[in-house]
Amino acid sequence: EKAMVDGSWLDLAKRSKLEAQPFAHLTINATDIPSGSHKVSLSSWYHDRGWAKISNMTFSNGKLIVNQDGFYYLYANICFRHHETSGDLATEYLQLMVYVTKTSIKIPSSHTLMKGGSTKYWSGNSEFHFYSINVGGFFKLRSGEEISIEVSNPSLLDPDQDATYFGAFKVRDID
């Protein structure tokens, strides 16, 4: 009986540790996509509707803030699209990029952790264009550090929650 109690206690401990593992999945807020044809920061994301969820991390001022030191897997998926019903592209040669950036408040500094994208030729003869970027990586993050997303040509962002999103989850503690 004692072994059983010990076992279930261990399970509970494991489960509560898992439940405390920080994670976030943030989806684009389509009502507030900034304008610009160069690199801009995307600051408006959902954290609590549809597929979006957050636990033991903080979302504030457009940035995902780390609350616990650890090794995290970071990911971002950005879709760009254009359909002729919305008008014409002013230029057919495009640089479609995403940058995942880490900012430290304690030692004021900013680093690009990941970038992805391509130059594209989106011909005016086509009715529809689409391009998707996915980046992901494993990073040591400290409490208080902030993760943000920058993109080029935000007016071409696909506003669906399954198209434009980013997130993080803690994989293990720092030894």
């Epitope: 304008s35 044809s37 919305s86 592209l89 002013a90 230029t91 040509n153």
Partner: antibody, heavy 126, light 103 residues
Framework: QVQLVQSGAEVRKPGASVKVSCKAS????????IHWVRQAPGQRLEWMGW????????KFSQKFQGRITVTRDTAASTAYMELRSLRSEDTAVYYC???????????????????WGQGTLVTVSS | EIVMTQSPSSLSASVGDRVTITCRAS??????LNWYQLKPGKAPRLLIY???SLQSGVPSRFSGSGSGAEFTLTISSLQPEDIATYYC?????FGQGTKVEIK
């Protein structure tokens, strides 16, 4: 305030060419596209083409392809539309119009014509 | 190529009347639809963009509605200065126009 001022009326013989100008003021000319639209007597408005005043990129209606040239002079904040091989059916009022999409804020020419020139009557007659 | 069809082609109404003009697209165009007012010898004027947004400086008696393929321009209380021809437009395509006259 934003203004587009077009050149005066023109009379041409069939087969000739005409060049209409559109001088912009009251905004940064290079940040917007200029469209050309015409209206023949008793007909609906007809889109002809646009020019991105910043980079000079152009797009034309299939109907006018090969006969139309649209250029701009950024120093003079002026767009020009030249139509060649004129025929009697080209008799119309020709308008320039500004697209309301600011190219600094995005790269989509949205076809919202927020300011128009006063129109230039081109008469093609033998 | 998308075709825009307006109805009626002309209408006659009294000052103060509510006037409605309809515009149909040959396929769905979301909300990418604009309305213009044309008076003889004057520059055309953008009234409504994006199906329902009122262009600045345009009187509030003008309103637009609709999405997909069917759209409406409404003048809530017709004024003498509203005598003109009205056109709907989606990108490169214009409707054939609706001429509004006073009875």
């Amino acid at each position: 305030q934003v203004q587009l001022v077009q050149s005066g009326a023109e009379v041409r013989k069939p087969g000739a060419s005409v060049k209409v100008s559109c001088k912009a003021s009251g905004y940064d000319f290079s940040n917007y596209a200029i469209h050309w639209v015409r209206q023949a007597p008793g007909q609906r408005l007809e889109w002809m083409g646009w020019i991105n005043a910043g980079n000079g990129n152009t797009k034309f209606s299939q109907k006018f392809q090969g006969r139309i040239t649209v250029t701009r002079d950024t120093a003079a904040s002026t767009a020009y539309m030249e139509l060649r091989s004129l025929r009697s059916e080209d008799t119309a009022v020709y308008y320039c119009a500004r697209d309301n999409s600011n190219m600094v804020r995005g790269i989509i020419i949205a076809y919202y014509f927020d300011y128009w020139g006063q129109g230039t009557l081109v008469t093609v007659s033998s | 190529e998308i075709v825009m069809t307006q109805s009626p082609s002309s209408l006659s109404a009294s000052v103060g009347d509510r006037v409605t003009i309809t515009c149909r697209a040959s396929q769905s165009i979301s909300r990418y639809l604009n309305w213009y007012q044309l008076k003889p010898g004057k520059a055309p004027r953008l009234l409504i963009y994006g199906a329902s947004s009122l262009q600045s400086g345009v009187p509030s008696r003008f309103s637009g509605s609709g999405s997909g393929a069917e759209f409406t321009l409404t003048i809530s209380s017709l004024q003498p200065e509203d005598i003109a021809t009205y056109y709907c437009q989606h990108t490169r395509a214009f409707g054939q126009g609706t001429k509004v006259e006073i009875k």
